[in-house]
Interface confidence: low
């Protein structure tokens, strides 16, 4: 065969981004001519699992029974053909949530919002955390405030949107991190639905609370879990 | 009443070591990382890095980088920078400070009042 | 790392005259968060830096109404509209956009 093999597929079901306790399963795709497939894991002795591949061989099942942190982090696959091993694959970022208390979702100064208003979504913790990740449920892509190199721990992280527009209605959650494991996330903050109406004269009630003053640090509850959504969600590192 | 409360002043000869002490009050100490400032005698100030006093974890600016090093006690409350194999520059007085402007919804600035290192054979 | 020009070196005003320092950025000091972290500081002799300004215009919580401050990208200007006895003393610019933080290399107020 002329040139280096193809790389491999690498992806995880049912996502990428798992609560503590959950199974996923790691998937590569290759080639028929595959005999073997390797799963590196980013810091971690190479290789990181060996699996052969089942029938029809183009693929190899990598499976993790319940997601700890352990397994979070950055993995890339190789498949081996008679003629050696093939480029690796894209890397893919499994990330887990539920490993800090969940922050809080709040919409300055209302989640009730007119069109061509302003508003401010507002992550808050109670510990500080160096990034925030909002997003929005069926989106492709979540909104993210990285790590900031300020000598100062954050609390919180604002979201501006200006001018708020009928896109911008819907629910958002968002979640919290270290900067030293992106790979690790908080549980995901309590639902806040984003309710954009047309004019003043037509106000729809809103589902839920505002907090119109930011609070300090130590005014933040510690919340029990919540659910995780797994869709539609990808890390986007700036 | 948030406070910064920093060691007395020091007189080292060069290639000596020097530990100052920073401890913070009113607070909770592990909310906001806690910067050290450098001023020399006469001039402006510079900044010297900072410790997330959360994690430990401690980013110098790049002149300030081998020789320097940041810790916390942080059962104390206390934050701490060292200052190995002393020389005549390193001569200047030392504040930490507290500093959080993240974002414009509320904001902390505490300073230390300074420790002054006297470098001299 | 960004280097911040303050001029004047020395501003010589008499109390009650209006004052104006300048600090000129080497690089616009607007965060990718859309924040500007510029701020003004005032140290008297002997003491420990005391903020005034933060963040280009916020007063700092107890700084009297005739400090204000204004500008952006890369420059910016802090006004005293009144000066009084208590103001004097060296004035610093600081960024801290970028990493390293940086500062000004002051402005001495003192009186005519």
């Known amino acids: 065969q002329a040139g280096p093999l193809p790389k491999p597929t690498l992806w995880a079901e049912p996502g990428s981004v798992i609560s503590w306790g959950n199974s996923v399963t790691i998937w590569c795709q290759g080639t028929l001519e595959a005999r073997e497939y390797r799963l590196d894991k980013e810091e971690s002795p190479a290789p990181w699992d060996r699996q052969n591949p089942l029938e029809p061989k183009n693929k190899a099942r990598f499976s993790i029974p319940s997601m700890t942190e352990d397994y979070a982090g950055r993995y890339r696959c190789y498949y081996r053909s008679p003629v050696g091993w093939s480029q690796p694959s894209d890397p893919l970022e499994l990330v887990m949530t539920g490993a800090y208390s969940k922050p809080t979702l709040s919409a300055l100064p209302s989640p009730l919002v007119t069109s061509g208003k302003s508003v401010t979504l507002l992550c808050q913790s109670r510990s500080p955390m160096d990034t925030f990740l909002l997003i929005k449920e069926r989106a492709a892509h979540p909104l993210l405030h990285l790590r900031s190199e300020h000598g100062a721990q954050q609390h919180q992280a604002e979201f501006p949107m200006s001018p708020v527009t009928s896109v911008h209605g819907g629910t958002y959650r968002c979640f919290s991190s270290h900067g030293f494991s992106h790979y690790l996330l908080s549980h995901p903050s309590d639902p806040l639905e984003l309710i954009v109406s047309g004019s003043l004269e037509d106000p729809r009630p809103s589902p839920t609370r505002s907090v119109s003053t930011a609070a300090g640090p130590e005014d933040q509850p510690l919340m029990p879990t919540g659910s995780v959504p797994h869709s539609g969600l990808r890390r986007h590192w700036e | 009443q948030i406070q910064l409360v920093q060691s007395g002043p020091e007189l080292k000869k060069p290639g000596e070591t020097v530990k100052i002490s920073c401890k913070a009050s009113?607070?909770?100490?592990?909310?906001?990382?806690m910067n050290w400032v450098k001023q020399a005698p006469g001039k402006g100030l510079k900044w010297m890095g900072w410790i997330n006093t959360y994690t430990g974890e401690p980013t110098y600016a790049d002149d300030f980088k081998g020789r320097f090093a940041f810790s916390l006690e942080t059962s104390a409350s206390t934050a701490y920078l060292q200052i190995n194999n002393l020389k005549n520059e390193d001569m200047a007085t030392y504040f930490c400070?507290?500093?959080?402007?993240?974002?414009?919804?509320?904001?902390?600035?505490?300073w230390g009042a300074g420790t002054t290192v006297t470098v001299s054979s | 790392d960004v280097v911040m020009t303050q001029t004047p070196l020395s501003l010589p005003v008499s109390l009650g005259d209006q004052a104006s320092i300048s600090c000129r950025s080497s690089?616009?000091?607007?965060?990718?968060?859309?924040?500007?972290?510029l701020h003004w500081y005032l140290q008297k002799p002997g003491q420990s830096p005391k903020l005034l300004i933060y963040k280009v215009s916020n007063r700092f919580s107890g700084v009297p109404d005739r400090f204000s401050g204004s500008g952006s990208g890369t420059d910016f200007t802090l006004k005293i509209s009144r000066v009084e006895a208590e103001d004097l003393g060296v004035y610093f610019c600081?960024?801290?956009?970028?990493?390293?933080?940086?500062f000004g290399g002051g402005t001495k107020l003192e009186i005519k």
């Open positions: 600081s960024q801290s956009t970028h990493v390293p933080y940086t």
């Open positions: 690089q616009s000091l607007v965060h990718s968060n859309g924040n500007t972290y």
């Open positions: 009113g607070y909770t100490f592990t909310n906001y990382g």
């Open positions: 400070a507290s500093i959080y402007y993240h974002t414009s919804l509320w904001y902390f600035d505490v």
